[in-house]
């Protein structure tokens, strides 16, 4: 009957759904100076929220517990911010201690379950 | 001047992004029959997608890492799922071992940044 | 049985240009990712570039990047790899390897390292 | 991008001895490392993926582990066809970086 058909579609696609968007870029706050490596640098804002793979993968598959949500792409963003540098006092007038700068973070454009185990056979 | 009033507004408000969107719910996909702690029923999906809190909290903060993202409002929404029952044989006709039903599964509507230590003096 | 051949490699001079072929067969060409390694006279094993299942993605080794193109014929089970601006340092035995199995249904990879191996063509780079 | 270092660069061992080779990741690369054996004159052959499963058809006195950075080949008992290089790699993204290679002679 139509119903049948429909709830088959309806439930096919709940399954597919499920799988497909699970592990995707979702937001995430990262530490400028710690992602940057950067140690006696000040930022504002200290944190930038950016792209990065998240969830869960291969939910109700024999393989499960060996799978992760990595980065399938990765790209490099711009982002503008305050930087502080520690001031040494000058002869004339006062250290620049702070500029707007330009950083680059990553972003995760893709996400893809990977396995590290065989497909089942 | 202008440029400098907006470029601080800007960095205000991404300085506002990276705490308020950092933790939220996301994508997961559970597993029907562990999250209803069936053991002999199985389900068709076998994992259907809902929100749970993820993400992080307190970045650039003293008390971060004592700072989980938890859910601040859950709610029960209901599924349209198959459910196949181990089948017994009947005297009269076949066992019904296949029906849809509707179950209730944990969506995280809201999330809340919650930290074990006390907030920096 | 799975394979994988590999063919055109040759003399070449400096900044010239060759093409390697790798032909597939005895098992879902499609579903695989596909690499190129090489490895010098005397020396290791050198990863050169990856191509996805579909030929949507490809990610080089720096050492190639801008000189080297990998590309796909799932129509004929057949990986290629487009060496320009030849140099002496390229000079290698290639072998094409069978790497990460794609599950389209249930949208996983299965990276468990590359498990088939071409026998290798020579490229010798030398004026 | 993640360095993969191989250790020793070479070694001499007897037949039946307990060899260990080691490969240590400059970033946590989970269990995502594969071992490979290439004899000489021949192409290489996958001995060990996920760090320590191995491959069909593989001798069991091969056995691999760790996880995260370091990790270890072990030949329980250095047989004679044995003599080979081996490789790690790691293979859950570009690049796929093989390390140096380690050369296994018998004494």
């Known amino acids: 009957s139509y119903h049948d058909r429909k709830s088959k579609v309806d439930l096919d696609r709940l399954n597919d759904d499920a799988k497909r968007y699970s592990c995707t870029p979702r937001n995430y706050s990262v530490n400028i100076r710690e992602e940057l490596k950067l140690a006696n640098v000040v930022f504002f804002p200290r944190c930038l929220l950016v792209q990065r793979c998240g969830g869960n993968c291969g939910c109700g598959t024999v393989n499960w517990r060996s799978c992760t949500c990595n980065s399938g792409k990765t790209v490099k963003k711009y982002h503008e911010v305050l930087q502080f540098e520690p001031g040494h006092i000058k002869r004339r007038g006062r250290a620049k201690t702070m500029a707007l700068v330009d950083i680059q973070l990553d972003h995760h454009e893709r996400c893809d379950c990977i396995c590290s185990s065989r497909p089942p056979r | 001047s202008y440029h400098d009033r907006k470029s601080k507004v800007d960095l205000d408000r991404l300085n506002d992004d990276a705490k308020r969107y950092s933790c939220t719910p996301r994508n997961y996909s559970v597993n029907i029959r562990e999250e209803l702690k069936l053991a002999n029923v199985v389900f068709f999906p076998r994992c259907l997608l809902v929100q749970r809190c993820g993400g992080n909290c307190g970045c650039g903060t003293v008390n971060w890492r004592s700072c989980t993202c938890n859910s601040g409002k859950t709610v029960k929404k209901y599924h349209e799922v198959l459910q196949f029952e181990p089948g017994h044989i009947k005297r009269r006709g076949r066992a019904k071992t296949m029906a849809l039903v509707d179950i209730q599964l944990d969506h995280h509507e809201r999330c809340d940044c919650i930290c074990s230590s006390r907030p920096p003096r | 049985q799975v394979q994988l051949v590999e063919s055109g490699g040759g003399v070449v001079q400096p900044g010239r240009s060759l093409r390697l072929s790798c032909a597939a067969s005895?098992?879902?060409?499609?579903?695989?990712?596909m690499h190129w390694v090489r490895q010098a006279p005397g020396k290791g094993l050198e990863w050169v570039a990856i191509?996805?299942?579909?030929?949507?993605?490809?990610y080089y080794a720096d050492s190639v990047k801008g000189r080297f193109t990998v590309s796909r014929d799932n129509s004929k089970n057949t990986l290629y790899l487009q060496m320009n601006s030849l140099r002496a340092e390229d000079t290698a035995v290639y072998y094409c390897?069978?790497?990460?199995?794609?599950?389209?249904?249930?949208?996983?990879?299965?990276?468990?390292?590359?498990?088939?191996w071409g026998q290798g063509t020579t490229v010798t780079v030398s004026s | 991008d993640i360095q993969m270092t191989q250790s020793p660069s070479s070694l001499s061992a007897s037949v039946g001895d307990r060899v260990t080779i080691t490969c240590r990741a400059s970033?946590?690369?989970?269990?995502?490392l594969a071992w490979y054996q290439q004899k000489p004159g021949k192409v290489p052959n996958l001995l060990i993926y996920?760090?320590?499963t191995l491959q069909s058809g593989v001798p069991s006195r091969f056995s691999g582990s760790g996880s995260g950075t370091d990790f270890s080949l072990t030949i329980s008992s250095l047989q004679p066809e044995d003599v080979a290089a081996y490789y790690c790699?790691?293979?859950?993204?570009?690049?796929?970086?093989f390390g140096q290679g380690t050369t296994v002679e018998i004494k």
């Open positions: 790699q790691k293979c859950n993204s570009a690049p796929w970086t």
């Open positions: 005895g098992f879902t060409f499609s579903s695989y990712g």
């Open positions: 970033q946590g690369i989970s269990n995502y």
């Open positions: 390897a069978r790497g990460y199995y794609y599950d389209s249904s249930d949208y996983l990879y299965y990276y468990y390292g590359m498990d088939v």
């Open positions: 996920a760090a320590s």
């Open positions: 191509i996805w299942y579909d030929g949507n993605d490809k």
